[in-house]
Interface confidence: low
Amino acid sequence: QAGPLPKPTLWAEPGSVISWGNSVTIWCQGTLEAREYRLDKEESPAPWDRQNPLEPKNKARFSIPSMTEDYAGRYRCYYRSPVGWSQPSDPLELVMTGAYSKPTLSALPSPLVTSGKSVTLLCQSRSPMDTFLLIKERAAHPLLHLRSEHGAQQHQAEFPMSPVTSVHGGTYRCFSSHGFSHYLLSHPSDPLELIVSGSLEDPRPSPTRSVSTAAGPEDQPLMPTGSVPHSGLRRHWE
């Protein structure tokens, strides 16, 4: 007897983090034998949607014309072939930005920092939130969470970095969110460029060297050191 049908591949275009109101297309790719594709959304009635395959039948398109909070969440897809339903795909987490007003991102004491010194990135929201995320552009693992404990809400989160090296240089943004749906994020903060000025022992890399490469330093998770600030927030790295 043949084994279970291979699981399909699920992805979103232009990406899985979508601004409110923008369109997004979810793709599910199975096999040429697929007769039907089904998309399930966590905590929604199943199936969330069904689609006939597009020629040559190995994938289906699920269109979201205008992103709203109802579409944010975790999805899985399946396909049906003449021998039955496939295994579920790996989950796709569709995140909506623009759910809350944008926070402010600043650097203390300054966005210009000498290599080896310390800097703290401060993300501040106008209304109390319980999750803050720091994003570094072009990083393979860009998310750094600070989440409040016991549901306590905060107006800000601190992301301390020490000691700073050239790897920390770059453009950052932050988001804020409420814990009851981590698929809903604020508008992004305005970008903050952190400039690391080198010493003789640690010259500042040229722009060409700071661009992310497949195995470059940007591919490592950003893990600022230092104690968690006294804000009731707990650090999570993803």
Epitope: W20, G21, E43, P65, D70, Y100, R126, H178, S181
Partner: antibody
Framework: QVQLQESGPGLVNPSKTLSLTCTVS????????WSWIRQPPGKGLEWIGY???????NYNPSLKSRVTISVDTSKNHFSLKLSSVTAADTAVYYC?????????????????WGQGTTVTVSS | DIQMTQSPSSLSASVGDRVTITCRAS??????LAWYQQKPGKVPKLLIS???TLQSGVPSRFSGSGSGTDFTLTISSLQPEDVATYYC?????????FGQGTKLEIK
């Protein structure tokens, strides 16, 4: 202070189309979900459907084949059409705003309601 | 579709009593639940969103709790003006189904 006001005929003949309009005053129609809800005499609330300012809609499956909700952002109003009505569609019809995640503080509940308009289906 | 079931359908309590109304979803809805109060002949009023977030201006004797499938609306000390029908509503995804309502009266 955002206010909603329903308008439309109070009497509709069976098999005809019920048409109601909800006018939004004191605020923008942007960035919120706008819903229709109805309540038959002596009964509970039934959600009919919503429209987003982008024009995206979602309807109650039990009414989907008969319902159309549209929005006119230039006039700051949205509308309900319910076709092929019967006596079972007699109800108070409310329009309501679902608080978005835009500083409304309501996190998804319907925080602003119209006063409701009574629609009777009868010949 | 997810069904929302409230209990009890009606109840009578004395002024000052602690009153609890429950709402159960047939599938998990996380915290995507609102509670409304509708006084006789009046428009529904939003009391609580996100299962436990009290709306501005709502008396603190009202509170909400729960997550997933089981939710509770509590009135810590019943007042005469609380006579109304209370509805829960889920909004994690359409349809945004209401519970059938709980009619609250004073003994």
């Amino acid at each position: 202070q955002v206010q909603l006001q329903e308008s439309g005929p109070g009497l509709v003949n069976p098999s005809k189309t019920l048409s109601l309009t909800c006018t939004v005053s004191g605020g923008s129609i942007s960035s919120y979900f706008w819903s229709w809800i109805r309540q038959p005499p002596g009964k509970g609330l039934e959600w009919i459907g919503y429209i987003y300012d982008s024009g995206s809609t979602n309807y109650n499956p039990s009414l989907k084949s008969r319902v159309t909700i549209s929005v006119d952002t230039s006039k700051n109003h949205f509308s309900l059409k319910l076709s092929s009505v019967t006596a079972a569609d007699t109800a108070v019809y409310y329009c309501a705003r679902r608080g978005g995640y835009y500083g409304s503080g309501s996190y998804g509940g319907m925080d602003v309601w119209g006063q409701g308009t009574t629609v009777t289906v009868s010949s | 579709d997810i069904q929302m079931t409230q209990s009890p359908s009606s109840l009578s309590a004395s002024v000052g009593d602690r009153v609890t109304i429950t709402c159960r979803a047939s599938q998990g809805i996380s915290n995507y639940l609102a509670w409304y109060q509708q006084k006789p002949g009046k428009v529904p009023k939003l009391l609580i969103s996100a299962a436990s977030t009290l709306q501005s201006g709502v008396p603190s004797r009202f509170s909400g709790s729960g997550s997933g499938t089981d939710f509770t609306l509590t009135i810590s000390s019943l007042q005469p003006e609380d006579v109304a029908t209370y509805y829960c509503q889920k909004y994690n995804s359409a349809p945004w189904t209401f519970g059938q309502g709980t009619k609250l009266e004073i003994k």
